[in-house]
Interface confidence: medium
Amino acid sequence: MMTGTIETTGNISAEKGGSIILQCHLSSTTAQVTQVNWEQQDQLLAICNADLGWHISPSFKDRVAPGPGLGLTLQSLTVNDTGEYFCIYHTYPDGTYTGRIFLEVLESSVAEHGARFQIP
């Protein structure tokens, strides 16, 4: 029985050239997190493995930094970074929890953070 929920930063926006922190938080479960994946649509950004630590995909090494915590920091943002991002928590004994964040990278300096929301 999967009882947990993932809280994410929801729909967020940031300025071109700036940076943004993608954060997910797994709550309402005592399951042990064994690995967290960060994926952008059909690309793997990074993995945080409980045993092996962080692995950043080579194509993102220059612009992606691990943390804070199990989150991910995207730097030197471009308009092409706009899109869906997924945090996938592999847990024991619950299984896999997935959270979704939508990032919009804006040309202007008007970039406001969206409200937090929960994904069951």
């Epitope: 064994t34 994926e39 993995i47 493995n49 409980a50 996938i88 024991y92």
Partner: antibody, heavy 122, light 111 residues
Framework: EVQLQQSGPDLVKPGASVKISCKAS????????MHWVKQSHGKSLEWIGR????????SYNQKFKDKAVLTVDKSSSTAYMEFRSLTSEDSAVYYC???????????????WGQGTSVTVSS | DIVVTQSPASLAVSLGQRATISCRAS??????????IHWYQQKPGQPPKLLIY???NLESGVPARFSGSGSRTDFTLTIDPVEADDAATYYC?????????FGGGTKLEIK
Amino acid sequence: EVQLQQSGPDLVKPGASVKISCKASGYSFTGYYMHWVKQSHGKSLEWIGRVNPNNGGTSYNQKFKDKAVLTVDKSSSTAYMEFRSLTSEDSAVYYCASSPLLRLRGYAMDDWGQGTSVTVSS
Amino acid sequence: DIVVTQSPASLAVSLGQRATISCRASESVDSYGKSFIHWYQQKPGQPPKLLIYVASNLESGVPARFSGSGSRTDFTLTIDPVEADDAATYYCQQNNEDPWTFGGGTKLEIK
């Protein structure tokens, strides 16, 4: 090259147990789930369950919950499936298969062992 | 459990023609824009081989003659054109929720 090498065929008596091994090589053992799949003669495939090598965490098909025990030995990159209280219905080929912990690949089982034939007979 | 039904159970197709295999799930296997359905090929005495993952993605090394389509509950594997080496049994499998389940298989015969 990814390889999943399973132990050889087994002839066992009803009521006994069998333990099948699956030794992985050519990839990072902890980056993949290991699954076990049953195929009775001339029949389709049945998913028995999976084990997460990171911590030995398991998820079972309820049908096999009291029949199969899945374990891993990280030090030797080997997964094991013990099948208990065997009956003639358990005579089948059993496969191990790995799936990367990647949502973008849908956790599909992209590498398979060669299969281990288990025959239950008195 | 999600029940996966394949049709037809067997299929005979002439060399060079198109083969179409259907797969239906008893409930949606979609999650966040991905369809968690995969296709495998199995030849006698061999383990299954992954052909298509996430409904439509061709596994590395698999010929482009194979393609997959569909979403939610209805999926299709197409082989066009069929070659002699394609004679095998094909299975679809869902893993949107536990337990992972397979279709009953479709045996493809080449005429």
